[in-house]
């Protein structure tokens, strides 16, 4: 039950963020023109990942696609591609995911199959939301270092009477919900997996009791129970014999000396 | 069609308040903003705030103490408020439309002559 | 705040000559997101009040006759008549439409001999 709630639960949250990452995508403001110690202009500039806008005061808003691919800075494309990879690796995830879910059965699915499944959309996510954060991380850098470089700007060159104003950029919206969306898909990935270590079906190997009639003495090896949970491991319960210590899948059983009295 | 009309005191005496209205038809206080914009007698235009569609407001520096600008959209009304007059204060007081683009003031009103004098 | 500067403060033509009058900003009216400079042209006919003539410094006005061109960017702008008639008599006003507070300049006086 708990491993179902925690694989749900992990694909809602995964769900959301990778909502928000396509979100934070395709919102304008990636960089909003700062407003603080700078003079009022009637017109307000932000500016996404594929266009810019001008919204006047009047409420009028102009916004420009970034027509060029060669002409944009390698840091925005390298941005773009980082938020479209996330994308692309949340989606696969999402598909993988819905098959793996616990609560829907699809034909005779093993549950092997299913944790496989679970952990590989759980990894897929993981990753989406690292490509996430790191898309907006590397903009949000390149955001500081342009605002530091256009406030020295501002105050040199400045000789004569006629100022010039350079617009300054500051964090937008799509920032943090670029950032806190690819936190949700990294959480919903990392709750994927722990999900897929609890439907991995267990592997119990049962050290059986081998009886050795050699004369009137019993040999008894009591051999315990082996558990364990391994991702694609064989699910098979093996019988362990003392006799050379071989598996019954390894060897067929040959009549031996010890074998009858 | 689109008309804006000033209406205020006509003589004040200084260091008292004033309010101009300007009463707008042909198009709506809540899509559009509205400026005021004064010309002493023989003189220039001084511009001296507006308000936004949205209700937000902005002056001019000069005069931001004493003046402020609030309307009321059901009536189609806008109004400036002036405080301690003076005689400098004289002049034609224009409410006119903000246009849609580039900022500029599309359609503007006749006018209000404002005296300052005791 | 923002000064505007207007030259000449008058000038008389005759119908149908071409007529140019400058404005100039003490600050760049030039918004980098759009490449629009943000200076707005009016002409005031005496006993009347202001009417809009050119806005984003070289786009006409609805109405406005083709005559009434706007150039210009930055600091400086121009406002050219290419054959002035005896109705252009006016004032004209450019105005910063890009800082708050908008501010006017002084005007030019345009007279028909």
């Known amino acids: 039950m708990a491993v179902t709630a925690c694989q749900g639960l992990g694909f809602v949250v995964s769900l959301i963020g990778i909502a928000g990452i396509i979100a934070a995508t395709c919102m304008d403001q990636w960089s909003t023109q700062d407003l603080y110690n700078n003079p009022v202009t009637a017109v307000f500039n932000y500016q996404g990942l594929w266009r810019s806008c001008v919204r006047e005061s009047s409420g009028f808003t102009e916004c420009r696609g970034y027509f060029t691919l060669l002409g944009l800075p390698a840091m925005l494309q390298a941005v773009r591609a980082l938020m479209i990879v996330g994308i692309v690796l949340g989606a696969i995830g999402l598909l993988v995911s819905i098959f793996a879910l616990k609560c829907i059965r699809i034909g005779s699915m093993e549950d092997s199959a299913k944790a496989n499944m679970t952990l590989t959309s759980g990894i897929m996510f993981i990753v989406s939301g690292l490509c996430a954060i790191a898309g907006v991380s590397v903009f949000a850098n390149m955001l500081v270092t342009n605002f530091w470089m256009s406030t020295a700007n501002m105050y040199t060159g400045m000789g004569g009477m006629v100022q010039t104003v350079q617009t300054r950029y500051t964090f937008g919206a799509a920032l943090f919900v670029g950032w806190v969306a690819g936190g949700l898909t990294l959480i919903g990935g990392v709750m994927m997996c722990i999900a897929c270590r609890g439907l991995a079906p267990e592997e119990t190997n049962y050290k059986a009791v081998s009886y050795h009639a050699s004369g009137h003495s019993v040999a008894y090896k009591p051999g315990g129970f082996k558990a364990s949970t391994g991702f694609g491991s064989n699910t098979k319960n093996k019988k362990i014999y003392d006799g050379g210590a071989r598996t019954e899948d390894e060897v067929q059983s040959y009549p031996s000396k010890h074998d009858y009295v | 069609q689109v008309q804006l009309k000033e209406s205020g005191p006509g003589l004040v005496a200084p260091s008292q308040s004033l309010s101009i209205t300007c009463t707008v038809s042909?198009?709506?206080?809540?899509?559009?903003?509205v400026h005021w914009v004064r010309q002493p007698p023989g003189k220039g235009l001084e511009w001296l705030g507006v308000?936004?569609?949205?209700?937000?407001?902005n002056y001019n520096s000069a005069l931001m103490s004493r003046v402020s600008i609030n309307k009321d959209n059901s009536k189609s009304q806008v109004f400036i408020k002036m405080n301690s007059l003076q005689a400098d204060d004289t002049a034609l007081y224009y409410c006119?439309?903000?246009?849609?683009?580039?900022?500029?003031?599309?359609?503007w009103g006749q006018g209000t002559t404002l005296t300052v004098s005791s | 705040d923002i000064v505007m500067t207007q030259s000449p403060s008058s000038l008389t033509v005759t119908a149908g000559e071409k007529v140019t009058m400058s404005c100039k900003s003490s600050?760049?009216?030039?918004?980098?997101?759009?490449?629009?400079?943000?200076l707005t042209w009016y002409q005031q006919k005496p006993g009347q009040p202001p009417k809009l003539l050119i806005y984003?410094?070289?786009t006409g006005e609805s109405g406005v006759p083709d005559r009434f061109t706007g150039s210009g960017s930055g600091t400086d702008f121009t406002l050219t008549i290419s054959s002035v008639q005896a109705e252009d008599l006016a004032v004209y006003f450019c105005?910063?439409?890009?800082?708050?507070?908008?501010?006017f300049g002084g005007g030019t006086k345009l007279e028909i001999k």
């Open positions: 006119a439309r903000a246009a849609y683009y580039g900022n500029g003031l599309d359609y």
């Open positions: 042909g198009f709506s206080l809540t899509t559009y903003g």
């Open positions: 308000i936004w569609a949205g209700g937000s407001t």
């Open positions: 600050q760049t009216l030039l918004n980098s997101g759009n490449q629009k400079n943000y």
């Open positions: 984003w410094a070289s």
């Open positions: 105005q910063n439409a890009y800082f708050y507070p908008f501010t």
